[in-house]
Interface confidence: low
């Protein structure tokens, strides 16, 4: 049995993916609830089962074709509905109409490598995955480097205002370990929020030639 | 059978709000996203809006402001409001349902109800 | 908004002529729609997703193209195909729907 409020939360890849997160205040005691998708506008459905995350809160993610097949449109509406078993009857913990391009998340940036690396600065680029060919360049990132003694949070956020996939670090100390991260955001979509962070990217500035400031 | 049947078509003043109905038989409402499209006397097709399975709406953003699409889902009927019309409203308003998917396109009409705005 | 273009705006043609019309988009659009509409009637609906037919639909009626040039096609034009034709996106919103063929028997 289930008991108190349900929070249910979902986004699109753009691509072919929707990862939804169900939270609910009360217990579920040896339940088993899954995630149905039905898309208004598609001859296909998908179902994922929920598995958790904490105490309180499940997750499963909806594959609905091959990672850089386009399944959805700007114009669809997937009903989404959180099912639990109750005996032999599945009830309906939670709904609703789910407009993929106004819930985007899409996954993080991958292949970051370091494109030229001098002393005081490190050119690097990356590529965005299973990113919608609709975005055109509709695209904005966020960058941030950690610095030795530093923490990822304290790190400042470096804002790129446009689809562009590479970034000149300025200002960098010589001889100095430091990681990248980036992370990528839609212009489109009520709902859309930042990618997560792409894995780190470990890179060593040159260290500075002896007698001269480079 | 699926069938939509609209009503509350007539003459309205200038000014005055418009509130038509589109009662649905043969499907129900909580299944399928149902539309509103008008058409001006001698002229084309404008589509106005629609209300989705779970209640959710989109509106052409033409008419946002003075739009309002609802459903009573005990009563498989769905509503259209709009307000402060002018002689440009003047149309033959029909709800449309989409085949078993969206992309089946609007296979479903209501016969569609006259609304004359005049004084 | 897409903007919806059809050519021409209206026809004659004799019983047995094959009739195109064409729709233009503005942009490009995924799924294109076609209906027959006669007079005093609601429209009705012909062709899905660019070229299926739509049930109870006779196979004079054809529709193909992409991106932003589509066609619609009346193999053999029949007297009961008086009507007006109009063309129609769901690519994005608002649907749109072109300005309507007015296809006449000489």
């Known amino acids: 049995a289930v008991n108190g409020t349900s929070q249910f939360t979902c986004f699109y890849n753009s691509r072919a993916n929707i990862s939804c997160v169900w939270s609910q205040d009360g217990a579920l005691q040896d339940t088993s609830c899954q995630v149905h998708a039905w898309p208004d506008r598609r001859r296909w459905n998908q179902t994922c089962e929920l598995l958790p995350v904490s105490q309180a809160s499940w997750a499963c993610n909806l594959i609905l074709g091959a990672p850089d097949s386009q399944k959805l449109t700007t114009v669809d509406i997937v009903t989404l509905r959180v099912l639990c078993r109750e005996g032999v009857r599945w009830r309906v913990m939670a709904i609703q109409d789910f407009k993929p391009f106004e819930n985007l998340r899409l996954m993080a940036p991958i292949s970051l490598q370091v494109v030229h690396v001098e002393t005081h600065r490190c050119n690097i680029s990356w590529e965005i995955s299973q990113a919608s060919h609709y975005f055109e360049r509709h695209l904005e990132f966020e960058a941030r480097t950690l610095s030795p003694g530093h923490t990822w949070e304290e790190a400042p956020l470096l804002t790129l205002k446009q689809k562009q996939e590479w970034i000149c670090l300025e200002t960098l100390t010589p001889d100095t370990q430091y990681e990248f991260q980036v992370r990528v955001k839609p212009l489109q979509g009520e709902f859309t929020t930042w990618s997560p962070w792409s894995q780190p990217l470990a890179f060593r500035t040159k260290p500075a030639a002896l007698g001269k400031d480079t | 059978e699926v069938q939509l049947l609209e009503s509350g078509g007539g003459l309205v003043q200038p000014g005055g709000s418009l509130r038509l109905s589109c009662a649905a038989s043969?499907?129900?409402?909580?299944?399928?996203?149902v539309h509103w499209i008008r058409q001006a006397p001698g002229k084309g097709l404008e589509w106005l809006g629609v209300i989705w399975s779970g209640g959710s709406t989109d509106y052409n953003a033409a008419f946002i402001s003075r739009l309002t699409i609802s459903k009573d889902n005990s009563k498989n009927t769905v509503y259209f409001q709009m307000n402060s019309l002018r002689a440009e409203d003047t149309a033959v308003y029909y709800c449309?349902?989409?085949?078993?998917?969206?992309?089946?396109?609007?296979?479903?009409w209501g016969q569609g109800t006259l609304v004359t705005v005049s004084s | 908004d897409i903007q919806m273009t059809q050519s021409p705006s209206s026809l004659s043609a004799s019983v047995g002529d094959r009739v195109t019309i064409t729709c233009q988009a503005s942009s490009s659009v995924s799924f294109m729609y076609w209906y027959q509409q006669r007079p005093g009637k609601a429209p009705r609906l012909l062709i899905y997703?660019?070229?299926n037919l739509a049930s109870g639909v006779p196979s004079r009626f054809s529709g193909s193209g992409s991106g932003t040039s589509y066609t619609f096609t009346i193999s053999s034009l029949q007297p009961e195909d008086i009507a007006t034709y109009y063309c129609q996106q769901w690519s994005t919103y608002p649907l749109t729907f072109g300005q309507g063929t007015k296809v006449e028997i000489k």
């Open positions: 449309a349902r989409a085949g078993d998917y969206n992309y089946d396109g609007f296979a479903y």
């Open positions: 043969g499907f129900s409402v909580t299944s399928y996203g």
């Open positions: 997703d660019t070229s």
